[in-house]
């Protein structure tokens, strides 16, 4: 566990010609705030895909009014750091999105108006516990200067916040084979000798490879809480107690959501649904009124004139959450056809089509026959994003360029002999059979199962199959 910290140093016009107009005016004073979104790895995700590592919103900056005729200066910034707590290991590589938002403070109906001023994004490698890294990013004519770092929360240490430190048991030195925990020299690196998977919160070990449970926990890895309602809770380090097991703890155990927020588990971690008046990763930000512009994504704020009265965000279609901060998963309906990949960009759905398909929902099957000829009188048939040739008799292969052997499939029945012919095949039937493929027996009395043979053909003669 740890915290990613972002410090915004300046936001203003970038170098070069074409300085941007000030986002604020005497008629429309405004103030800035920032949003950061973090994702693990260096993946090429859509900007609007979930902030799996977390997200944070800054406070509002000071109100700024443009001085008439003056160029747009660096704009006044909010105080403090943006902090994104992360629950698990720090991934080392991450993607970030930093958005600069403008809040207009004119006399809008329903509270202040919001608009996105700039968005920058990047991918970085960063070890936890290292120094501040400085960065400059440009978005159009704007320039954003910032620093960032990742730091571990005790007792975690290390570049991924996965090593644990414990206070020294002896004042002078660490135990055998254990190093001091830099930079916490008064602490020692915890021995990683317990059984693999042993719960760091509810288990401990005194011998390598064991996992002993604290009171109230059981199971081989001390991950199963002991129910006190149906049995006696054993004192001290427990063993598994029959009939007393309930499901093991999840990310919502102990409810990490503050201020009455409700917790729901996600595949990676947890998500808090906050009551009105609170927001943030753990519903920790409070005292919000409509004047603070708490409704994201064009949501309309109603009520909440003072910090003690609740506000309500009326969300536009496609957004939800107490602050309209969450997008409805429209891709779950799988609108993209033919195996296309769905991307929900908020303002629109996009489909990334597989080869051979096009259109807003990959609904057009591209005609791969265009510009491709099938040889020797073959006709092109399109389907599935690929073309194939339906070949004329006597030809085969992808483009009908290969001369087919019509006898390869042994088409002549009852021992008839097959002869390739320029326009097909000819079967020479064995005695007692007739027909184009020798499929009809000749009856012993001389009559056949067919009407009389066509003039000029006697039973037993080769029959040409056209």
């Amino acid at each position: 566990a740890g915290v990613f910290e972002l410090q915004i140093h300046s936001f203003g016009p970038g170098p070069g010609p074409g300085a941007p107009r000030s986002p604020c005016s005497a008629r429309l004073p405004c103030r800035l705030f920032f949003r950061v979104c973090l994702k693990p790895g260096l993946s090429e995700e859509a900007a609007e895909s979930p902030c799996a590592l977390g997200a944070a919103l800054s406070a509002r900056g000071p109100v700024y009014t443009e001085q008439p005729g003056a160029p747009a200066p660096d704009l006044p910034l909010p105080d403090g750091l943006l902090q994104v707590p992360f629950r698990d290991a720090w991934p080392g590589t991450f993607s970030f999105i930093i958005e600069t938002w403008r809040e207009e403070l004119g006399d809008q109906i329903g509270g202040p108006a919001w608009s996105l001023l700039a968005r920058v994004a990047g991918r970085r490698r960063l070890a936890a516990g290292g120094p501040w890294a400085r960065d400059i990013q440009r978005a159009g004519a704007w320039e954003l200067r910032f620093s960032y770092r990742a730091r571990c929360e005790p007792p975690a240490v290390g570049t991924a916040c996965t090593r644990l430190c414990r206070p020294r048991s002896a004042p002078s030195r660490c135990g055998p084979g254990l190093r001091p925990c830099a930079p916490l020299e008064d602490e020692c690196e915890a021995p990683l000798v317990c059984r693999a998977g042993c719960s760091p919160e509810h288990g401990f070990c005194e011998q390598p490879g064991e996992c002993r449970c604290l009171e109230g926990w059981t199971g081989p890895l001390c991950t199963v809480p002991v129910s006190t309602s149906s049995c006696l809770s054993p004192r001290g380090p427990s063993s598994a107690t029959t009939g007393c097991l309930v499901p093991g703890p999840g990310p919502c155990d102990g409810n990490p959501c503050a201020n009455g927020g409700s917790c729901s588990e996600t595949p990676r971690s947890f998500e808090c649904t906050c009551p009105r008046g609170f927001y943030g990763l753990r519903c920790e930000v409070s005292g919000v009124t409509c004047a603070d512009g708490p409704c994201f994504n064009g949501g309309l704020c109603v009520g909440g004139a003072d910090p003690d009265s609740a506000y309500i965000c009326h969300c536009p279609p496609g957004f939800q959450g107490s602050n309209c901060e969450k997008r409805v998963d429209r891709c779950s309906l799988q609108p993209c056809r033919n195996g296309g990949l769905c991307l929900d960009l908020g303002h629109a759905l996009r489909c990334r089509c597989r080869a051979g398909f096009a259109g807003p929902r990959c609904e057009h099957d591209l005609d791969d026959c265009a510009g491709r000829a099938c040889a020797n009188g073959g006709t092109c048939v399109e389907g599935g994003g690929a073309h194939r040739c339906s070949c004329a008799l006597g030809f085969g292969g992808r483009d009908c360029r290969e001369r087919a052997d019509p006898c390869a499939a042994r088409p002549c029945a009852h021992g008839g002999r097959c002869y390739a012919h320029f326009s097909g095949l000819v079967c020479a039937c064995a005695p007692g059979y007739m027909g184009a493929r020798c499929e009809f027996p000749v009856h012993p009395d001389g009559a056949s199962a067919l009407p009389a043979a066509p003039p000029g053909l006697r039973p037993g003669d080769p029959q040409r199959y056209l």
Partner: nanobody, 120 residues
Framework: EVQLVESGGGEVQPGGSLRLSCAAS????????MGWYRQAPGKQRELVAG???????KYAESVKGRFTISRDNAKNTVYLQMSSLRAEDTGVYYC??????????????WGQGTLVTVKP
């Protein structure tokens, strides 16, 4: 502009049934995908059942075997037959449609929602 009008919501006892309807009207060239989402109090809006862009039916795990989605293409309408209703099925049910308004232009539309309450 396309309108989606839902109907059929109401209050029912556990184990009971309801049938929701959603009719699409307006400038519709064709309907690409259409289905039902629900939003329970304090929860996220989630897909319940729908017809995908490829015309397949899709159901949330929690409703499989209890809910059935059907459609009348001539009327641009989808139906959700809900049986063996449970308390956790309570919520506002929203119709959603991904609609081609002409051959190459498609947009997503939501209905206003219809409330389903399951209580003894």
């Amino acid at each position: 502009e396309v309108q989606l009008v839902e109907s059929g919501g109401g209050e029912v006892q556990p184990g009971g049934s309801l049938r929701l309807s959603c009719a699409a009207s307006g400038s519709i060239f064709s309907i690409n995908a259409m289905g039902w989402y629900r939003q329970a109090p304090g929860k996220q809006r989630e897909l319940v059942a729908g017809f995908t862009g490829d015309g397949m039916t899709k159901y949330a795990e929690s409703v499989k075997g209890r809910f059935t989605i059907s459609r009348d293409n001539a009327k641009n309408t989808v139906y959700l037959q809900m049986s063996s209703l449970r308390a956790e099925d309570t919520g506002v049910y929203y119709c959603a449609a991904d609609v081609f308004t002409d051959r190459d232009h498609v947009d997503w539309y939501w209905g206003q929602g219809t409330l389903v309450t399951v209580k003894p």
